[in-house]
């Protein structure tokens, strides 16, 4: 950066090199050039010469003032106009940054994705800080009182092998940057309660010719968890509203779910599961598209032959076996 240049003087920032976005700041430049009583001192920001708000303080020093500085990063340097020198002489440079102190991390969540061998902890970091912000994840065993700390810039994967202090833990997150530090509330977890089953995947669909044609969706998961509850949501691609069906599932065999759908319409299906009675759901599976036939012939759609688009984490709460609509969309 600009800070690696050889200086013939000194440049500094008040209140600090890293400061709160929107503040008024002063950048000072002090020349120390042999045989030069500077006629003028010039400031440059990102290579652009500044014209206004420059005040000469004394023979060797000038100040550049910025009101309501909003740029996350800027490279500043200053130069001197020396008598009998044709070109400006470089004095010094400095990289400056503006941003915000971190918000209190909230929505701390820790889950174990089946087969991952990790506990993944995430949180809502709040508003963008614009400056380097680090997070320390504290994991404290409620059985042994032993505490471990993990430094990260975003989320963290903690090997389950390193969680040797039993099953119950307190987890909290500390956020810190040059402008401040905040700490989340403590989350109490039990390792057995935070496992998310292996992803459920829709493999194919077929519409069977009958008096009333029906569509069968084939789906499966590699989970070894015995009691799994799943939801399948579906809608015509032209609709905003999802229909949601709930299932208590045993994945010892491929699941088949029947739907009575309108003819000649493109539908989209997604599935997600959780260990029955537990808190965390899988994210919705990739969208699976199936177009129902106009008339009677059998139509099959296979997985991985569909368009892809980002799925959300829409939630539906219904009674087992009950068909509902979820108006929240994606």
């Amino acid at each position: 950066g600009i800070t690696n240049i050889n200086c013939s003087g000194h440049i500094w920032v008040e209140p600090a090199t890293i400061f709160k976005m929107g503040m008024n700041i002063s950048i000072y430049c002090q020349a120390a050039i042999k045989n030069c009583q500077p006629r003028k001192l010039h400031f440059y920001k990102n290579g652009i010469k500044e014209r206004f708000q420059i005040t000469r303080i004394n023979k060797t020093t000038a100040r550049l003032w910025y009101k309501n500085f909003l740029e996350p990063h800027a490279s500043m340097y200053c130069t001197a106009e020396c008598p009998k020198h044709f070109q400006e002489t470089l004095i010094c440079g400095k990289d400056i940054s503006s941003g915000y102190p971190p918000d209190i991390p909230d929505e701390v969540t820790c889950v174990i994705y089946e087969y991952s061998g990790n506990m993944t902890c995430t949180w809502n970091a709040g508003k963008l800080t614009y400056i380097d912000t680090k997070y320390v994840v504290h994991v404290k065993s409620l059985e042994t009182e032993e505490e471990q700390q993990y430094l990260t810039s975003s989320y963290i994967n903690i090997s389950t092998d390193s969680l040797q202090g039993g099953k119950k833990y307190l987890v909290w997150v500390q956020a810190a940057n040059a402008l401040g530090m905040e700490e989340s509330k403590q989350l109490q977890i039990h390792l057995d309660d935070i496992v998310i089953p292996s992803a459920a995947v829709i493999s194919r669909a077929e519409t069977i010719n009958a008096t009333v044609p029906k569509t069968i969706i084939y789906w499966d998961s590699q989970t070894t968890i015995e009691k799994v509850s799943c939801e399948m949501r579906y809608k015509a691609t032209t609709n905003q509203t999802w229909n949601v069906k709930e299932f208590d599932t045993n994945f010892t065999y491929v699941q088949q779910s029947e739907f009575y759908l309108e003819p000649n319409i493109k539908y989209v299906f997604q599935v997600r599961c959780q260990e029955t009675g537990k808190r965390y759901w899988q994210p919705w599976s990739s969208p699976f598209f199936h177009k129902t036939p106009e008339t009677v012939p059998q139509v099959t759609s296979k997985a991985f032959q569909h368009d892809t688009w980002n799925s959300g984490l829409t939630v539906a709460s219904i009674s087992t076996g009950h068909l509902t609509s979820d108006n929240r969309g994606d």
Epitope: I48, I54, N58
Partner: antibody, heavy 119, light 107 residues
Framework: EVKLVESGGGLEQPKGSLKLSCTVS????????MSWVRQAPGKGLDLVAD??????????YYADSVKDRFTISRDDSQSMVYLEMDNLKTEDTALYYC??????????WGQGVMVTVSS | DIQMTQSPASLSASLGETVSIECLAS??????LAWYQQKPGKSPQLLIY???SLQDGVPSRFSGSGSGTQYSLKINSLESEDAATYFC?????????FGGGTKLELK
């Protein structure tokens, strides 16, 4: 030879508008700052508006008395500088000079163009 | 903005005399001062910049001096063509500001 030629002056009523132009030749226009300096009859010199070169990101300055009424602009490809004057007042009556600065002092001046604001 | 006070407002002198015009800045301007000559019906011409540097083509009877807040323009051996109004300009801090002018008449 450095030449600055102003045009566009004349008689205008209060609240009226005029656009002054300045054609420049004889030096590297792109690296120079351009200003309009005015001189009311029998009075001193006042900087009205200034537009800097690309190295200053074309930063502009206006005297408080003309802020929000006057607009300075430049066309580097044509070596031209302009001063659009709206909502003219009688106190804007003056001889308007187009000037060049490489440092901050005004090195070269045009012959001036008269602007008279009167009802 | 930096204020420039020029004195005298007018002066009358004879051919061959030496005259001085003063400019006082409201704060130290670190030799960032220029002097201009304006003849009746003409545009100003740069005489001196950086307080003491003579612009090309300007006769050597013109000289500038000073430091800090006080600066002066000296004209030696006045000639008839020197009858004009003289202005100082500070360009130490933005915006540049002019002195009020000194009208020099020849007797």
């Amino acid at each position: 030879e450095v030449k600055l030629v102003e045009s566009g002056g004349g008689l205008e009523q209060p609240k009226g508008s005029l656009k002054l132009s300045c054609t420049v030749s004889g030096f590297d226009f792109n690296s120079a700052g351009m200003s309009w300096v005015r001189q009311a009859p029998g009075k001193g010199l006042d900087l009205v508006a200034d537009i800097n070169s690309k190295s200053y990101n074309y930063a502009t300055y206006y005297a408080d008395s003309v802020k929000d009424r006057f607009t300075i602009s430049r066309d580097d490809s044509q070596s031209m500088v302009y001063l659009e004057m709206d909502n003219l007042k009688t106190e804007d009556t003056a001889l308007y000079y187009c000037t060049v600065h490489h440092s901050d002092y005004f090195e070269y001046w045009g012959q001036g163009v008269m602007v008279t604001v009167s009802s | 903005d930096i204020q420039m006070t020029q004195s005298p407002a007018s002066l009358s002198a004879s051919l061959g005399e030496t005259v001085s015009i003063e400019c006082l800045a409201s704060e130290d301007i670190y030799n960032n001062l220029a002097w201009y000559q304006q003849k009746p019906g003409k545009s100003p011409q740069l005489l001196i910049y950086h307080a003491s540097s003579l612009q090309d083509g300007v006769p050597s009877r013109f000289s500038g001096s000073g430091s800090g807040t006080q600066y002066s323009l000296k004209i030696n051996s006045l000639e008839s063509e020197d009858a004009a109004t003289y202005f100082c300009l500070q360009d130490s801090e933005y915006p540049p500001t002019f002195g009020g002018g000194t009208k020099l008449e020849l007797k």
